[in-house]
């Protein structure tokens, strides 16, 4: 390369003037389902799933963490965020995860991904998949998966909330799932 | 900028250690749908798809090789794994994809994104869509779409498992496909 | 670091021969459903959606801009692409998405996220959903998700074309959405 | 076959480290997690440290942490415990066992695969 | 951290005898428990996990049972191979405890 001089270092890279960062040191995380413990809520506020962080195909890394239900963002900066939500519903009594007189039967099942930001009250819906259920078998299951690309910010919290929790398939971590990267 | 002297050389990007590396030059694949060729699997065993890996808008890059229904992962890190499967079934009996008496009407449709690890003969599962069938019409269709990120070795193989091979959709590489990015 | 002499220049990042460019400066986009007006089409030609891209949610950047029904891609790379779009149909005359006696229940929903290059005159189609609708209630309501990586050229052209302009949902910016970003 | 092999004991004087290893095969390294569990002469079984082989996350006894550093290396599919200042009653048979997690939100698993064990004495 | 108490420290029983054993944590596992058998000069080995599930290769003759505090391990009819050393551990918080055994000898 010999000595450099005066105006001739020019490294392929110098039209970047935000600072180059590792690909491997992004905020990254991979959540896995867990058996929910059902929990009180609102009538028209659906409930959070909480999840699996470290365990199995779960990890979180490089500062992104999970803490009570929510994945908590580290750095400002484009996220993709993802999730698949796997329901099912039995018709018989017995089931297990028939609770409390319910109907196993919805008219509906809704995923939403939801935003929280501490100095804002109100939380913020990036994603929702929502689809009607008019399955004529006594047990049925189905899939709803979201992703997308947000702009967040430093502080900003996550989280997973579904229109009925005990229909949510917790059986598997690669039926449900929650997870997000720094692009 | 002058001669580099002492320590006056500090790029903005000098709080990063690992190895930077353009993006162009990570792994990448989009794979797209073929016509399957009928083979024997186990009885609980998914069979897996096979792919185009050139022609349309199939590819392959940056020592990402796939042979023999696998993506080979050439490098370790965190990939983006995707599939879509587009299902179809038609309860006439001269269907193209009806298949020695096999019922075209099936209980339930799945996907399987599945990682297999030389030094280990059991695959891991990664992800999985499934949906049990209610369809009512004589002829239905419908896709299972899956995306999540997972942690890598090199060396790992990914492939796609789907429950019945004669319901896969091989008729567009749009409707059906499997690909793979390093992060 | 002392001076830097002959060859004793050799960073961590001497590997990479392409550009490096800060991440943060990359192509992106995310862009929400709004209210459509309804467009003549050719009958075996599926309208194309217009979207919002700048309020709520909705942000294009780094030279990505939208026109007119399309993404406009500044720069030459692989690309994430990615849509949802939720359908909805009643069966009630009264329904606002009810249309100039199309019927509201029709054989099947297919959302097509297509590519045009001016050069060329037949668009591309990348990715497609598509789904037999066999619901026996009166309202019904579901997603169809797509997303997946391509080669894209500077000066293509990305849009979302679906089978009934009347049954997307437009109600809600998480419901139904358009998105793409440099890898 | 599933194995895990231990070894790296041995006799050390107080004050003094040493590292351990343990050697996985027959299976998928990286999925399962693996935790290291000591055994004093006569006594229980006390958990020392667990890591994530898949992605690094790791914990540590709360009478341990910071003297001992468990770490892997993925493509050697092998597991480290790095032990400092180490003392008499550190003193015990080491055992790395493999973190079987099964898979499900439903279950926490167990250890379903354990080493031989290597004895590490600390004395002078 | 979470305390593991089991009990009895030994029990003393003849073969073909029914074995109870008792874990009780100081604050709730769910039912994220798992029992051990250690033999004298061996590794410890997995018998049951999440209280009641029984680990591959596991004799029929073992169960397992409890949620939240109190935990029972039962060994319905013992065989000679299984008189040992029987350890619970709690894999609900980190860091994992295990119990300080309980020892089933012969009578």
């Known amino acids: 390369m010999g000595a450099l001089k005066g105006q001739e270092f020019a490294p392929s890279h110098q039209q970047v003037y935000a600072p180059l960062r590792a690909d491997g040191d992004k905020p990254r995380a991979h959540l896995t389902v867990v058996r929910q413990t059902p929990t009180q809520h609102f009538k028209n506020q659906f409930p959070a799933l909480h999840w699996e962080h470290e365990l199995g195909l779960a990890f979180t890394k490089n500062r992104m963490n999970y803490t009570n239900k929510f994945l908590l963002i580290p750095e400002s900066g484009d996220y993709f965020i993802y999730s698949q939500v796997t329901f099912r519903g039995m018709t018989s009594e017995s089931s297990e995860i028939r609770q409390a007189g319910r109907p196993n039967k919805p008219d509906s099942i809704t995923v939403v991904i939801t935003k929280v930001t501490d100095s804002y009250p109100e939380p913020t819906q990036l994603l929702m998949g929502t689809k009607s259920v008019s399955e004529v078998g006594s047990n049925w299951f189905q899939p709803i998966y979201l992703g997308a690309m947000f702009s967040l910010q430093e502080g900003d919290k996550l989280m997973v909330n579904v229109s009925d929790i005990s229909l949510v398939d917790y059986t598997k971590e690669d039926k449900t799932f929650f997870g997000a990267f720094l692009l | 900028m002058g001669a580099l002297k002492g320590q006056e050389f500090a790029p903005s990007h000098q709080q990063v250690y690992a190895p930077l590396r353009a993006d162009g030059d990570k792994p990448r694949a989009h794979l797209t749908v073929v016509r399957q060729t009928p083979t024997q699997h186990f009885k609980n065993q998914f069979p897996a798809l096979h792919w185009e890996h050139e022609l349309g808008l199939a590819f392959t890059k940056n020592r990402m090789n796939y042979t023999n229904k696998f993506l080979l992962i050439p490098e370790s890190g965190d990939y983006f794994i995707y599939s879509q499967v587009t299902f179809r079934g038609m309860t006439s009996e001269s269907s193209e994809i009806r298949q020695a008496g096999r019922p075209n009407k099936p209980d339930s449709i799945t996907v399987v994104i599945t990682k297999v690890t030389d030094s280990y003969p059991e695959p891991t599962q990664l992800l999985m869509g499934t949906k049990s069938v209610s369809e009512v019409g004589s002829n239905w269709f419908q896709p299972i779409y899956l995306g999540a990120m997972f942690s890598l070795q090199e060396g790992d193989k990914l492939m796609v498992n789907v429950s019945d091979i004669s319901l896969v959709d091989y008729t567009k590489e749009d409707k059906t496909f499997f690909g793979a990015f390093l992060l | 670091m002392g001076a830097l002499k002959g060859q004793e220049f050799a960073p961590s990042h001497q590997q990479v021969y392409a550009p490096l460019r800060a991440d943060g400066d990359k192509p992106r986009a995310h862009l929400t459903v709004v209210r459509q007006t309804p467009t003549q089409h050719f009958k075996n030609q599926f309208p194309a959606l217009h979207w919002e891209h700048e309020l709520g949610l909705a942000f294009t950047k780094n030279r990505m801009n939208y026109t007119n029904k399309f993404l406009l891609i500044p720069e030459s790379g692989d690309y994430f692409i990615y849509s949802q779009v939720t359908f909805r149909g009643m069966t009630s005359e009264s329904s606002e998405i009810r249309q100039a006696g199309r019927p509201n229940k029709p054989d099947s929903i297919t959302v097509v996220i297509t590519k045009v290059t001016d050069s060329y005159p037949e668009p591309t189609q990348l990715l497609m959903g598509t789904k037999s609708v066999s619901e026996v209630g009166s309202n019904w309501f579901q997603p169809i998700y797509l997303g997946a990586m391509f080669s894209l050229q500077e000066g293509d052209k990305l849009m979302v074309n679906v089978s009934d302009i009347s049954l997307v949902d437009y109600t809600k910016e998480d419901k139904t959405f358009f998105g793409a970003f440099l890898l | 076959e599933v194995q895990l092999v231990e070894s790296g004991g041995g006799l050390v004087q107080p004050g003094g480290s040493l590292r351990l290893s343990c050697a996985a095969s027959?299976?998928?390294?990286?999925?399962?997690?693996i935790s290291w569990v000591r055994q004093a002469p006569g006594k229980g079984l006390e958990w020392v440290a667990w890591?994530?082989?898949?992605?690094?996350?790791?914990h540590y006894a709360r009478m341990l942490q910071g003297r001992f550093t468990i770490s892997r290396d993925n493509a050697k599919n092998s597991l480290y415990l790095q032990m400092n200042s180490l003392r008499a009653e550190d003193t015990a048979v080491y055992y790395c066992?493999?973190?079987?997690?099964?898979?499900?939100?439903?279950?926490?698993?167990?250890?379903?695969?354990w080493g031989q064990g290597t004895t590490v004495t600390v004395s002078s | 951290e979470i305390v593991l108490t089991q009990s009895p420290a030994t029990l003393s029983l003849s073969p073909g005898e029914r074995a109870t054993l008792s874990c009780r944590a100081s604050?709730?596992?769910?039912?994220?428990l798992a029992w051990y058998q250690q033999k004298p000069g061996q590794a410890p080995r997995l018998l049951i996990y999440?209280?009641?599930n029984r680990a591959t290769g596991i004799p029929a003759r073992f169960s397992g049972s409890g949620s939240g505090t109190d935990f029972t391990l039962t060994i319905s009819s013992l065989e000679p191979e299984d008189f040992a050393v029987y350890y619970c551990?709690?894999?609900?918080?980190?860091?994992?405890?295990f119990g300080q055994g309980t020892k089933v000898e012969i009578k």
């Open positions: 066992a493999r973190e079987n997690y099964y898979g499900s939100g439903a279950y926490r698993g167990g250890m379903d695969v």
């Open positions: 027959g299976y998928d390294f990286t999925y399962y997690g």
């Open positions: 890591i994530s082989t898949y992605n690094g996350n790791t």
């Open positions: 604050q709730s596992v769910s039912s994220y």
């Open positions: 999440d209280a009641s």
């Open positions: 551990q709690q894999r609900s918080n980190w860091p994992w405890t």
